[in-house]
């Protein structure tokens, strides 16, 4: 038997992926566990193998179909179970009735690139990945810039309250190395959360022209 507190958290990426994390204090170390998804109104069901991400937590991705296919809607309810092998049987360790559009977390933005860089400013663009057509252009973004000598946690957050897949960073220091990240969130869903941060994009501002006031 497994004692201790258990936490089972899942998010829908709005298209064809449900990502889950299961945490269990005092969990069995060498037991095979999986997440099973059983929708209430679809003909498919899906399973993924839970893999350790730390000493007491496991994660897996339920792939429901092609990345850009719309596999679930607001009326779907998916029963999600954590099943762990006990001898020849499977034991239910956690269960939840999952409402996908109340528990959204989009994929991190991709394809970050520097469009134009100057001494004091830099224009950066990105793309969103696997976001439902239901949202149309109604998404919000947060961005942050890592300056020399600072940490990501210290970086001020810039908020974009519309689907704007670019930003012009101003008041930068010439000839300086920076890093930039962005994340995205839809408006819908009581338990919806920000996407993971994008991979950081490194860029360097241009040096100030010699003999000029900067």
């Amino acid at each position: 038997a497994v004692n201790g507190t258990s936490q089972f958290t899942c998010f829908y990426n709005s298209r064809a992926n449900i990502s889950c994390v299961w945490s269990q204090d005092g969990a069995l170390q060498d037991t095979s566990c999986q997440v099973h998804a059983w929708p209430d109104r679809r003909r498919w069901n899906q399973t993924c193998e839970l893999l350790p991400v730390s000493q007491a937590s496991w994660a897996c991705n339920l792939i429901l179909g092609a990345p850009d296919s719309q596999k679930l809607t607001t009326v779907d309810i998916v029963t999600l179970r954590v099943l762990c092998r006990e001898g020849v049987r499977w034991r239910v360790m956690a269960i939840q009735d999952f409402k996908p559009f109340e528990n959204l977390r989009l994929m991190a933005p991709i394809s970050l690139q520097v469009v134009h860089v100057e001494t004091h400013r830099c224009n950066i663009s990105w793309e969103i990945s696997q976001a439902s057509h239901y949202f149309e252009r109604h998404l919000e973004f947060e961005a942050r810039t890592l300056s020399p000598g600072h940490t990501w946690e210290e970086a001020p957050l810039l908020t974009l309250k519309q689907k704007q897949e670019w930003i012009c960073l101003e008041t930068l220091t010439p000839d300086t190395q920076y890093e930039f990240q962005v994340r995205v969130k839809p408006l819908q869903g009581e338990f919806t959360t920000w996407s993971p941060w994008s991979q950081p994009l490194a860029f360097r501002t241009k040096p100030a022209a010699l003999g000029k006031d900067t």
Partner: nanobody, 119 residues
Framework: EVQLVESGGGLVQTGGSLRLSCAVS????????MGWYRQVPGKQRELVAD???????KYADSVKGRFSILRDSVKNTVYLQMSSLKPEDTGIYYC?????????????WGQGTQVTVSS
């Protein structure tokens, strides 16, 4: 302003058929589910049938095999083909549409159409 306009209700004898239709119009929206609910006096509105994106239909047990739902996503219209009607199918039939407007999802209802099955 979103509008749901129902039609097709009426009086029919036991064993007869009716076809209800409901058209959604108005401001810019994306529909992900459309369906029909029934209300009889003194009772809660209950699901008769609905259809979500991906062709996933859901029916009340009492109508399975007798009613069929059809959704035309291009015309934003849903139909309920009712056959082998029984007196217990009598009630007000309401159309419901789940609509995405400006990035948020809400449910919208029609005014209802009366279906009466006489014995």
């Amino acid at each position: 302003e979103v509008q749901l306009v129902e039609s097709g209700g009426g009086l029919v004898q036991t064993g007869g058929s009716l076809r209800l239709s409901c058209a959604v119009s108005g401001s810019r929206f994306i529909s992900d589910v459309m369906g029909w609910y029934r209300q009889v006096p003194g009772k809660q509105r209950e699901l008769v049938a609905d259809m979500a994106d991906g062709g996933s239909a859901k029916y009340a047990d009492s109508v399975k095999g007798r009613f069929s739902i059809l959704r035309d996503s291009v015309k934003n219209t849903v139909y309920l083909q009712m056959s082998s009607l029984k007196p217990e199918d009598t009630g007000i039939y309401y159309c419901k549409a789940g609509l995405w407007i400006a990035g948020r999802h809400s449910d919208y209802w029609g005014q209802g159409t009366q279906v009466t099955v006489s014995s």
